[in-house]
């Protein structure tokens, strides 16, 4: 009886539209028992792993990936995946990070709330292999 791993979710704090130079934190969530969360950028070729996993609730764990000073190059699509040995989960939906010049205008808020249920998501591709979430043999590049 194969146990299905729930898909992770991804959100961004304080939002998905971030002024240049400000900080953003991606929050990945999954079930209890996750050892490693992986934040993938655009495609699987660039990612960052963390084992700093905390229990967000009795049934949920989470990890946080912070970019201290957002640059234009940080804009793009992000998604989460997790390792609950011996299996990797499916990917979360995509979350799009937008980077804007700081305008400071009163009519434009600095950030918009963002999560994997938000309007900027795309459905994840289904070409994943649960045992090979990153391109085989490809060296991990840090996201920041």
């Amino acid at each position: 009886q194969e146990e299905d791993l729930p898909r992770p979710s991804i959100s961004a704090e304080p939002g998905t539209v971030i002024p240049l130079g400000s900080h953003v934190t991606f929050v990945c969530r999954g079930p209890v028992g996750v050892q490693t969360f992986r934040l993938e950028r655009d495609s699987r070729s660039t990612y960052n792993d963390t084992e700093d996993v905390s229990q967000a609730s009795p049934s949920e764990s989470e990890a946080r990936f912070r970019i201290d000073s957002v640059r234009e190059g940080n804009a793009g699509l992000y998604r989460c995946i997790y390792y609950k040995p011996p299996k990797w989960s499916e990917q979360s939906d995509y979350l799009e990070l937008l980077v804007k010049e700081s305008s400071g205008g009163p009519d434009s808020p600095d950030t918009e709330p963002g999560s994997s249920a938000g309007p900027t998501q795309r459905p994840s591709d289904n070409s994943h292999n649960e045992h090979a979430p990153a391109s085989q043999g490809l060296k991990a590049e840090h996201l920041y």
Epitope: Q1, E3, V32, G33, Q35, T36, R38, D49, T50, E51, Y83, P85, P86, W88, H131, A132, P133, A134, Q136, G137, L138, A140
Partner: antibody
Framework: SVKESGGRLVTPGGSLTLTCTVS????????IQWVRQAPGKGLEWIGF??????GYYASWAKGRFTISKASSTTVELKMTSLTASDTATYFC??????WGPGTLVTISS | ELVLTQTASSVSAAVGGTVTISCQSS???????LSWFQQKPGQPPKELVY???TLQSGVPSRFSGSGSGTQFTLTISDLECDDAATYYC??????????FGGGTEVVVK
């Protein structure tokens, strides 16, 4: 596949490095576990290295045993201050589902 | 210290019968990280069950795992001669530490 190498006869107090060579999967996606089994005895967990490259160890193994990624396809287990009680077959495994045949380490003068 | 106790060092049953192997942990296993292994002489262990009750691919449904917290069991039904082996439980604990039980030999009559 997974295969251990480097086992041999070592004198007490000596050091030894074992190598786990993997093929068909990426070390960046799996825990690589090390386990040993003394002749006629049970299995004993030593430690593992995670996809992120962090090492986790049994309390008795800390300090004397070090697990590291030596290349994109090899993981090493470095053992120091060896004694007769370290005589065992040493196994590496991809998490727990794929094991090597083991390599015999004998500590004797 | 983490201790996994397999109370019976040996159990026996006839072909077609059922055996139950118990495993008790001194601490609660983390998030059902309890595996069962089969080992035959001269071979590496083979994982049968992980996450307490999930069968590894290719393992017959005659094998089943159950339990929670600190008490776990492996049941082998419709026993076959090929099931004669030593069976080990393995617990995973918060902080990513693991420990094996002492093993239970299954004798098929």
């Amino acid at each position: 596949s997974v295969k251990e190498s480097g086992g041999r006869l070592v004198t007490p107090g000596g050091s030894l490095t074992l190598t786990c060579t993997v093929s068909g999967f990426s070390l960046s996606n799996y825990n690589i576990q090390w386990v040993r089994q003394a002749p006629g005895k049970g299995l004993e967990w030593i430690g593992f290295i995670s996809p992120a490259g962090n090492g986790y160890y049994a309390s008795w193994a800390k300090g004397r045993f070090t697990i590291s990624k030596a290349s994109s396809t090899t993981v090493e287990l470095k053992m120091t201050s060896l004694t007769a009680s370290d005589t065992a077959t040493y196994f590496c495994a991809r998490h727990w589902d794929l094991w090597g045949p083991g390599t015999l380490v004998t500590i004797s003068s | 210290e983490l201790v996994l106790t397999q109370t019976a060092s040996s159990v026996s049953a006839a072909v077609g019968g059922t055996v139950t192997i118990s495993c008790q942990s001194s601490q609660s296993v983390y998030s059902n990280y309890l595996s069962w292994f089969q080992q035959k002489p001269g071979q590496p262990p083979k994982e049968l069950v992980y996450w307490t009750s999930t069968l590894q691919s290719g393992v017959p449904s005659r094998f089943s795992g159950s339990g929670s917290g600190t008490q776990f069991t492996l049941t082998i039904s419709d026993l076959e001669c090929d099931d004669a082996a030593t069976y080990y439980c393995l617990g995973g604990y918060s902080g990513w530490f693991y420990a094996f039980g002492g093993g239970t030999e299954v004798v098929v009559k």
